[in-house]
Structure formats: structure tokens, C-alpha cells
């Protein structure tokens, strides 16, 4: 697997004091920031659960995997990790529940092998376009990311700052086609209401997209047609009513794609007849037996395999002046 | 893990099904390919079968190699017809990595010799 | 099809030596980045050692490095160790319209000097 061990062995702790120094210095090569655990065997750097407030300054060059998570850290600023000389080899880097609510413009950037970053569990209301790719340039350079994790940064109601969520998130993953490399992108449990249509048009290398948990309600706009490396897209535990005839033939065309479909409130009347016969057919859906009719009430919890044309009716459609308050 | 059964000597012509038993991990849920190594040679790559099925040859196997699985058995296999002197090697089954295109893990392999 | 030239096909060094093998695609690699290379010893099956070109893979010393993009790869071991001497594949992927191929160089055989 791709993602960095999360135990190492061979720990050296610093002593707890000073958590935010700055060092004018380059950091020793063995040098551990205070407050974290450190294995220079296992290239891994934790500073776990420790209410840190700002990323420390004196990371170890040597790190490849770096844990930041359970922190306080509200704002990662420009340059975060920058450093002299750069923290080159670092590859992974877990931010998750750290009680990010802003990342600003260029945060990750001179981190030249950042392959996976987990932002999960972060109120993200202040996700800059720039994060990801760091200028505003219409094409920036490729960031090096292949892995971006993205479960849960949704922030609480009322700090959403009157914009579109989906929107923001968005213009990060598409700013300046800097993504274009990307391979896994995680956004589950954010409450996506919509999925904008040109955002997996953009981000052509993608082999796991995760949208479980959301509160998508069509996929009518979206095309998956460009997603020629697709393995796995995970819609559990959505909105979906039905899947129409064009999403169909759009994933039914991708050659590895599994999708995954539990947990979504099925409407069973005549427009899912389509979506009914695919199904029997495909290979594509996985537990595909488990899929159950949520609406109308008559069909509550029939299995979507078993229906046939004449279960999936639509009632007439009743002129207004017969229609009933 | 993974580990490769099924080999043995095998007569010009002949055909031989290698078996590849996957644990730890469903086999479903990964690409997995096969690759052979001739005695004191180099690696060299037969083909590999996609999550959802789908197969990919070296030209020089397409034909007489067919790689497949049964993912109730969580077991891998891989059918050679036709067999000549020059396919005596070791056979590996390896796991794809499934972010990267690289074998991150590898079987024991199995020894098949064709001969009369 | 792809070709992938290992050079050299050997070579002699002593414990401490650094010691650099290249490896040249006759076209580009998938996502100019897909080169892995792989340490094997006598009797056993190859081993990971360096993914998607510079990754070096779990557990493996830091003392092995990798670089390069597109056609042309570069694996350095910076100083040698007694347990180095082995065989190293480099190994690519490539996509095409009508799907995958993976291929393998021919191998450099790393031996005492």
C-alpha cells in the first residue's frame, strides 16, 4: 500500500518545553522539535495530541512521514513548511483534527516530494484556491501530490462564510491544473449538496474517488468520462435517487471501474427501469444485491435486482384542478 | 502473502495451470500480475489482470498465456498452453501497489521446466 | 513494444563505494514517473526498493536513492554495505490507448570488487 506507517520504532522524545521556538539555525540532523517523537530509522517525525499551535520550526530534514494530527493549529500560513534547506524528502504529511480552519495560499509549498496530505477533520472554513498549487497562475507547476485526503473538513454552519462549500473546495483541487497528477481524493462526510461538473474533467489520473457520506442527490451533470483509470468510486451513503441513462453508459465505459452505491434512498417508480436493467447486467456495481428501494412507500426495502418493469410505475400526474392540497 | 503452487516438469507442447494463493488481502481488490525469470536470467513480465477483470498481455504471451482468478478462492492463476524449452523459469505472482504502478508484493515463485 | 536498457549489465565495487546504475525507456513511462527498481538476491523472489521513480519504499535504507523522469532513471547507493551486493531490476509502466504493459530492464549484477 501507498500510505506512510503510522508506528515506528525507535522513538526519541524531546524535552517538553519550547513547543513554537524558532531556531535562526538549521536543525541538527538528529534534532527532534520539542513535544514530538522522532525515528530517524523510520524517517518519521509525531507530534500527536499535543494542542501545538504552529507547525514546528525545527523539523528534522530527514523526515519522510510527518504527524501533526490532534493539534490547535487554526491557521496554516504560506510557506508552513518551508524550510532551509527544505524538508526535501518529505513524502506523507497528516494534518487530520487539528483544528485547521484556514489554509492559506502556498502552504505546502517547497515540499518537492509530497506525495499523500490528510486534512481530514479540520473545520476548513477558509480553504484558499491557491492552497494546493501556491500562485494564481492559470497553469501552475504539477504539484508532486498523489494522495489528498479530504474526509470531514466541512466547518460548522454558521462559519461558512456565505460562500458555496463545494465551491471552495473545488476551485482548490482545479486552481492553476496543479492536481492533474492526482490519484486518490477523499471527500466523504463533507454534505455535498452537488459535485460541480468540471471538476473531474480536470483531474484525468484519478484511480479512487471517495464521495461517501455526502448529500449528493444526482449525478446528472457529472461526466466520468475522461476518468480512464478509475478503479473505485465510493457513493455510499448519499442522496441518490437514481442513476440516469448517461451516468450509466459513462461508468459501464470505464474499464476498471467498481462503484460503490449502498445506503442511498432508491426512488423505484418509472424512472429507475433504466437503471433496473443495467444493473442486472453489470459488473461494475459491487454488493449490488444489497441495493433497496427507499420510495415510494409500497416499495420500501425491495432489492432493485428483483423489481421488473411492471413494479416501476409513476402515478399520473393529476391536472391541477383535480389536484388535492 | 502470497504463494505460488503448481509448478513442475511439464513436456514440450504440454499445457500447466500455476496457482497464486492470496492472504491477508482480498484478491479482488488489487491488481495482481505474473512474472517469470528464466535460470540466470533477467525478470521478465507475462501480464496482469485489473480489479474488475480486465487483462493485459506481453505481446510475446498474448495467445498462450491466460491469467484469471476466483475471487471466492481469493486465488489467482495462470494457464500455459503450448509450452516450449525456452519458458522454463521461475514463475512469481506480485501484487500491484493499488496508488502506484509498481509490485510491492512478491510470491516465492514456483519452478516449471519443460522438457522431454 | 518497450524496451528498458539496464547499464551496466555489471559491475565490481567495495563496501563504501558509491555506486550508480541507469535506466533508459525507449519511450516515456507512464506519468513520466511510473520507474520502480527492485534488489534481488540469489534463490529469492526481487524486492521493492524504489517506486514512482525517487519513493523510496518502506523499510528500505536511506542510503539507496532514486531520480529521474520520463526516459532516463538513476538508482545510487551512496555507500555500499556488505548486504548491497545483489542484482537490481528497474522496472516501468506504460499506458497506451489499448491498455497496460509493464516491462523490466535486463539487470545489473552488483558484485565484490
Known amino acids: 500500500s501507498s500510505s506512510p506507517t503510522s508506528s515506528a520504532s525507535s522513538f526519541s522524545s524531546s524535552a517538553p518545553f519550547l513547543a513554537s521556538a524558532v531556531s535562526a539555525q538549521p536543525p541538527l540532523p538528529d534534532q527532534c522539535p520539542a513535544l514530538c517523537e522522532c525515528s530517524e530509522a523510520a524517517r518519521t517525525v509525531k507530534c500527536v495530541n499535543r494542542n501545538l499551535t504552529e507547525v514546528p520550526t525545527d523539523l528534522p530534514a530527514y523526515v519522510r512521514n510527518l504527524f501533526l494530527t490532534g493539534n490547535q493549529l487554526a491557521v496554516l500560513p504560506a510557506g508552513a513548511f518551508a524550510r532551509r534547506p527544505p524538508l526535501a524528502e518529505l513524502a506523507a504529511l497528516n494534518l487530520s483534527g487539528s483544528r485547521l480552519d484556514e489554509v492559506r495560499a502556498g502552504a505546502f509549498e517547497h515540499l518537492p516530494s509530497l506525495r499523500q496530505l490528510d486534512l481530514s477533520h479540520n473545520p476548513l472554513a477558509d480553504l484558499s484556491p491557491f492552497a494546493f498549487s501556491g500562485s494564481n497562475a492559470s497553469v501552475s507547476a504539477p504539484s508532486p501530490l498523489v494522495e489528498l485526503i479530504l474526509n470531514h473538513i466541512v466547518p460548522p454552519e454558521d462559519e461558512r462564510q456565505n460562500r458555496s462549500f463545494e465551491g471552495m473546495v473545488v476551485a482548490a483541487l482545479l486552481a492553476g491544473r496543479a492536481l492533474q497528477g492526482l490519484r486518490r481524493l477523499e471527500l466523504a462526510s463533507n454534505h455535498f449538496l452537488y459535485l460541480p461538473r468540471d471538476v473531474l474533467a480536470q483531474l484525468p489520473s484519478l484511480r479512487h474517488l471517495d464521495l461517501s457520506n455526502n448529500s449528493l442527490v444526482s449525478l446528472t451533470y457529472v461526466s466520468f468520462r475522461n476518468l480512464t483509470h478509475l478503479e473505485s468510486l465510493h457513493l455510499e451513503d448519499n442522496a441518490l435517487k437514481v442513476l440516469h441513462n448517461g451516468t450509466l453508459a459513462e461508468l459501464q465505459g470505464l474499464p476498471h471501474i467498481r462503484v460503490f452505491l449502498d445506503n442511498n434512498p432508491w426512488v423505484c417508480d418509472c424512472h429507475m427501469a433504466d437503471m433496473v436493467t443495467w444493473l442486472k447486467e453489470t459488473e461494475v456495481v459491487q454488493g449490488k444485491d444489497r441495493l433497496t428501494c427507499a420510495y415510494p412507500e409500497k416499495m420500501r426495502n425491495r432489492v432493485l435486482l428483483e423489481l421488473n418493469s411492471a413494479d416501476l410505475d409513476c402515478d399520473p400526474i393529476l391536472p391541477p384542478s383535480l389536484q388535492t392540497s | 502473502s502470497v504463494e505460488e503452487s503448481g509448478g513442475g516438469l511439464v513436456q514440450p507442447g504440454g499445457s500447466l495451470r500455476l496457482s497464486c494463493a492470496a492472504s491477508?488481502?482480498?484478491?479482488?481488490?488489487?491488481?495482481m500480475s505474473w512474472v517469470r525469470q528464466a535460470p540466470g536470467k533477467g525478470l521478465e513480465w507475462i501480464g496482469i489482470i485489473a480489479g474488475r477483470g480486465s487483462t493485459y498481455y506481453a505481446s510475446w504471451a498474448k495467445g498462450r498465456f491466460t491469467i484469471s482468478r476466483d475471487n471466492s478462492k481469493n486465488t489467482l492463476y495462470l494457464q500455459m498452453n503450448s509450452l516450449r524449452a525456452e519458458d522454463t523459469a521461475v514463475y512469481y505472482c506480485?501484487?500491484?501497489?493499488?496508488?502506484?504502478?509498481?509490485?510491492?508484493?512478491w510470491g516465492q515463485g514456483t519452478l516449471v521446466t519443460v522438457s522431454s | 513494444a518497450q524496451v528498458l536498457t539496464q547499464s551496466p549489465s555489471s559491475l565490481s565495487a567495495s563496501v563504501g563505494d558509491r555506486v550508480t546504475i541507469t535506466c533508459q525507456s525507449s519511450?516515456?513511462?507512464?506519468?513520466?514517473?511510473?520507474l520502480s527498481w527492485y534488489q534481488q538476491k540469489p534463490g529469492k523472489a526481487p524486492k521493492l526498493l524504489i517506486y514512482y521513480a525517487s519513493t523510496l519504499a518502506s523499510g528500505v535504507p536511506s542510503r539507496f536513492s532514486g531520480s529521474g523522469s520520463g526516459t532516463d532513471f538513476t538508482l545510487t547507493i551512496s555507500s555500499l554495505q556488505p548486504e548491497d551486493f545483489a542484482t537490481y531490476y528497474c522496472q516501468g509502466s506504460y499506458y497506451s490507448g489499448s491498455g497496460w504493459y509493464y516491462a523490466f530492464g535486463g539487470g545489473t549484477k552488483v558484485e565484490i570488487k
Open positions: 506480485a501484487r500491484v501497489s493499488s496508488i502506484y504502478y509498481t509490485f510491492n508484493l
Open positions: 519511450q516515456s513511462v507512464y506519468s513520466n514517473n511510473e
Open positions: 491477508g488481502f482480498s484478491l479482488s481488490s488489487y491488481w
